[in-house]
């Protein structure tokens, strides 16, 4: 077909410790030769799909997939993964071909799949799709850690069935709340497998290989605590072994603890007891309530009492596959350029995500936060008063979840002005969106008052960059106003902004910034 | 599904008592455990005492000696015994089994 562009796609490789990536994701540096990924066009396929070579990369490298049309004309383009759209910013090289990147930084998991580039040209439209997976994904695995009891002894064992062989270790820590975080000096971490010390209050068994790091807390209930207001609750998946640990504290060791489920004693065999003096005398006792590999009949309230606290219970729900609930529906903010502000995310999931924010094709670490009431939530306050789409995407072993957010900064417009032979335009991207007028500077009109009304083009939104809306209007030029100075206004509830500009022959044309 | 319904409270003179009710429905009253919570206005709900299915008892440390709960499995109903009431226990009472609460009856002491 002589109407279709002429396409290049290269796979660029940056090196890992190259300062150049990320600083811009339009036209990141190129670390190494790029590969020619041949693009061609896919047979049977209903309208023009070219595929590029399946991209195959290592865990954590960064790579940009970039296109490059040889196509007369300006080009417009959208990304498209895993049905969230990316908007692209195409540019043009030396040679006049146009140019669109996508930079993936650290490769992860939830990075992987296809990417669909669609790009629209004067002649014709037409899709470019890249498959990107990570290398050795099939041979490396990581599984979240699970307990078993060690066999004759009153100890834990911690595996995690992963490939390449995890080095596993307990997380412990004795004191309350937010001190038990990771980098606290109340944390001890031993490097081993079995754990004899299980009278302490928080208790993590974690495990790290080449594809990160996978945590697992033994679920404890404590009747020393004071009863919370919403039940704690334990979600696992069939097959899956459960745990939870009661613990309490007395004066002195006349008091036992009990398990039940549902108002019914578990059976012998699902639970052990120990017990210890503490420094001060004071009797500890914990009991375990554990099942190798639970079932459906396995829900229900767990209920641990003593004769000498208050009983307390928790829910323990057995699902068939994992989950993410969350709300999806987009939301947008509006704020001021010097508010205070956070994006987030409150959901509930089993397995535990992972997840990731997304701004303008650059991925950042997202941290979660687990809530009293079951509930986790994430939230992403980095994001320098950029407007534009903020996207939120969480994964476990069963499912995804994606949430756009919006964020409009309130300013003044600021306007920036073009010409050409036949016209003039003014671009402003101040919010929200600006109203236009121009105005022509003559003899009658020394101060530009006078308004012109004949031959304006108003654009609101044009162009979305990265979810940021420009506004343009454009004026054709004619012989009234040839040769005059015009000025061309952006307003908005903020303020005023205006640019004006020399309308003469063809040529370099002055631009005059008028606040 | 269990279900309750709080009664009982009021307005009551400081150094008054009052004795809020908590009738369930369901089988399982006998078996469960009982707590009772309340929450002032504006402040954080908190737990005040709880009876279990053998009918042990404990208590908030700081209400022991002026409240007593007890229960009545034949009619499904629990009970909080409110004596010497001062305006700082002026609040909504709530009771609970397992994630189960009632609507909440109000409780106001004035001075």
């Known amino acids: 077909n002589q109407d279709l562009p002429v396409i290049k796609c290269v796979l660029i490789n940056h090196k890992n410790n190259d300062s150049s990536v990320g600083k811009s994701s339009s036209y990141p540096m190129v670390s190494e030769s790029p590969e020619d990924l041949g693009c061609a066009l896919r047979p049977q396929s209903s309208g023009t799909v070219y595929e590029a070579a399946a991209v195959e990369v290592d865990v954590s490298a960064s790579i940009t997939l970039q296109v490059l049309v040889d196509a007369p004309g300006n080009i417009s383009c959208l990304w498209v993964f895993k049905h969230s759209s990316l908007n692209c910013q195409p540019h043009f090289d030396l040679q006049n071909r146009g140019v669109v990147s996508m930079v993936i930084l650290k490769m992860t998991e939830t990075q992987a799949g296809e990417y669909l580039l669609f790009i629209q040209s004067e002649a014709t439209n037409y899709t470019i799709l890249f498959t990107v997976s990570i290398r050795n994904t099939l041979l490396y695995t990581l599984r979240r850690p699970y307990f078993r009891k060690m066999e004759n002894q009153d100890a834990l064992v911690c595996i995690s069935e992963s490939v390449p062989e995890p080095i596993v270790e307990w997380v412990l820590c004795d004191s309350q709340g937010e001190s038990c975080k990771e980098e606290s000096p109340a944390v001890v971490k031993k490097e081993e497998k079995v754990l004899h010390e299980l009278f302490g209050t928080d208790i993590r068994c974690c495990a790290r290989n080449e594809l990160g790091r996978e945590c697992t807390r033994l679920f404890t209930i404590d009747l020393n605590q004071t009863p919370q207001t919403t039940l704690p609750q334990l979600f696992l998946k069939v097959g899956e072994p459960l745990w939870i640990r009661c613990k309490a504290v007395h004066v002195n060791h006349g008091f036992g603890l009990t398990w039940e489920l549902e108002n019914k004693a578990l059976e012998e065999g699902n639970y052990f007891e120990m017990s210890t003096y503490s420094t001060n005398r004071t009797m500890i006792r914990i009991l375990f309530a554990f099942v190798s590999s639970v079932a459906r009949n396995d829900t229900g309230y767990y209920t641990c009492s003593s004769s000498k606290h208050p009983s307390q219970s928790a829910l323990v729900t057995i699902v068939e596959k994992g989950f993410i609930n969350a709300t999806n529906s987009s939301e947008d903010y509006e704020i001021d350029q010097y508010e205070e502000f956070c994006f987030s995310v409150r959901f509930k999931a089993y397995p535990q995500i992972r997840c990731t924010w997304t701004f303008s094709r650059k991925s950042f670490p997202c941290e979660q936060k687990g809530l009293d009431n079951g509930y986790s939530i994430s939230k992403f306050c980095n994001h320098k008063h950029q407007p534009g789409e903020y996207i939120f995407h969480a994964e476990n072993d069963d499912a995804q979840f994606t949430k756009m957010f919006t964020l409009n900064i309130r300013r003044k417009p600021q306007v920036l002005a073009e010409a050409s032979a036949s016209q003039a335009s003014c671009f402003s991207d101040g919010y929200p969106l600006p109203s236009w007028t121009w105005k022509k500077c003559s003899d009658k009109s020394p101060n530009c008052t006078e308004e012109i009304t004949e031959g304006v083009w108003n654009r609101k939104a044009n162009r979305k960059v990265f979810g940021q809306w420009v506004s343009s209007s454009t004026l054709n030029m004619s012989e009234a106003i040839k040769g005059f100075l015009v000025k061309c206004c952006a307003y908005n509830s903020l303020g005023t902004s205006c640019e004006t500009i020399l309308l003469n022959s063809p040529g370099p044309f002055p631009f005059i910034q008028d606040n | 599904q269990v279900q309750l319904q709080e009664s009982g409270g009021g307005l009551v003179q400081a150094g008054g008592s009052l004795r809020l009710s908590c009738a369930a429905s369901g089988s399982t009253f006998s078996k469960n455990y009982i707590d009772w919570y309340r929450q002032a206005p504006g402040k954080q709900r908190e737990w005040v005492a709880q009876?279990?299915?053998?009918?042990?008892?404990h208590y908030e440390p700081s209400l022991k000696g002026r409240f007593t709960i007890s229960r009545d499995n034949a009619k499904n109903t629990a009970y909080l015994q409110m004596n010497s009431l001062k305006p700082e226990d002026t609040a909504v009472y709530y009771c609970?089994?397992?994630?189960?609460w009632g609507q909440g009856t109000q409780v106001t002491v004035s001075s």
């Open positions: 609970r089994i397992l994630d189960y």
């Open positions: 009876i279990t299915s053998g009918g042990n008892t």
